[in-house]
């Protein structure tokens, strides 16, 4: 599941990892666009063992995975859905 969140909070990620996480262990991916108090885009991966990791948006594997997820969501939904939430 790919989710885009707009929040009014400051940056959520203190540390980012570029270590590959296989899709089989990923529960959902949360994207926090830059702005609203945080100068950078943040990607938060929620794993199936309930742990959470911030992933470097420049990591090649997460870019590939998000592209695949975007293509899939655009082929199943007529219009992309962006959730506006305050976690």
């Amino acid at each position: 599941v790919l989710e885009v969140y707009y929040t009014s909070l400051r940056c959520r990620c203190v540390q980012e990892s570029s270590v590959f996480i296989p899709r089989r262990f990923i529960d959902r991916i949360q994207i926090l666009p830059r702005g609203n108090g945080c100068p950078r885009k943040e990607i938060i991966v929620w794993k199936k063992n309930k742990s959470i990791v911030c992933v470097d948006p420049q990591a090649e594997w997460i870019q590939r995975m998000m592209e695949v997820l975007r293509k899939r969501s655009s082929s199943t939904l007529p219009v992309p859905v962006f959730k506006r939430k305050i976690p």
Partner: antibody, heavy 123, light 106 residues
Framework: EVQLVESGGGLVKPGGSLKLSCAAS????????MSWVRQTPEKRLEWVAT????????YYPDNVKGRFTISRDNAKNNLYLQMSHLKSEDTAMYYC????????????????WGQGTSVTVSS | DIQMTQSPSSLSASLGGKVTITCKAS??????ITWYQHKPGKGPRLLIH???TLQPGIPSRFSGSGSGRDYSFSISNLEPEDIATYYC????????FGGGTKLEIK
């Protein structure tokens, strides 16, 4: 040559505990995730647990979660499976397997397996 | 949880012939499927990963294909050493094995 040798299996009563071990050689153990998979008497294969290369991440299916614990000792090249509150349905041959996912381009799932150790849960 | 339905559960074929085994997933597994050969007293041997990529050292007689929910595995020019049980495994969402196919030679 990659080698995985399981040990520690045996006969245990329902509700009992058992710890399985897997000795790895022929590859850099600390660079690979590892898994346990079992084969039931009906010859079905079931995934049991996976641990990341450094040991910080573990994953289990719901039917063993809370009863089984996977762990590793990278200094000794050993993988472990601590099983507790054992049930008759845990009777199986238990295999350890190397889980290779170097990147999204190199994701082979479980590429090398041991020969297994047998666990029987019976009163 | 993803279910993997493998068929047939057993089959018999002649030496030199060809067999095909199928696995159907309960949802799209995005080509994340492997195929294993399992012989008694040994651990499973990985033949193919990511639907169709042959492991090093595996003869080209073995092949795999598919997409979405439907996948197949074939062995051509059957040889006596191919007698074994074959399993599929999805690794798109955790792990689920198919029920296995026992191959016998006529």
């Amino acid at each position: 040559e990659v080698q995985l040798v399981e040990s520690g299996g045996g006969l245990v009563k329902p509700g009992g505990s058992l710890k399985l071990s897997c000795a790895a050689s022929g590859f850099t153990f600390s660079s690979y995730a590892m898994s346990w998979v079992r084969q039931t008497p009906e010859k079905r294969l079931e995934w049991v647990a996976t641990i990341s290369d450094g040991g910080s991440d573990t994953y289990y299916p719901d039917n063993v979660k809370g009863r089984f614990t996977i762990s590793r000792d990278n200094a000794k090249n050993n993988l472990y499976l601590q099983m507790s509150h054992l049930k008759s349905e845990d009777t199986a041959m238990y295999y350890c397997a190397r889980d290779y996912y170097g990147s999204s381009y190199e994701d082979y799932a479980m590429d090398y397996w041991g020969q297994g150790t047998s666990v029987t849960v019976s009163s | 949880d993803i279910q993997m339905t493998q068929s047939p559960s057993s089959l018999s074929a002649s030496l030199g012939g060809k067999v095909t085994i199928t696995c159907k997933a309960s949802q799209d597994i995005n080509k994340y499927i492997t195929w294993y050969q399992h012989k008694p007293g040994k651990g499973p041997r990985l033949l193919i990963h990511y639907t169709s990529t042959l492991q090093p050292g595996i003869p080209s007689r073995f092949s795999g294909s598919g997409s979405g929910r439907d996948y197949s595995f074939s062995i051509s020019n059957l040889e006596p050493e191919d007698i074994a049980t074959y399993y599929c495994l999805q690794y798109d969402n955790l792990y689920t094995f198919g029920g296995g196919t026992k191959l016998e030679i006529k």
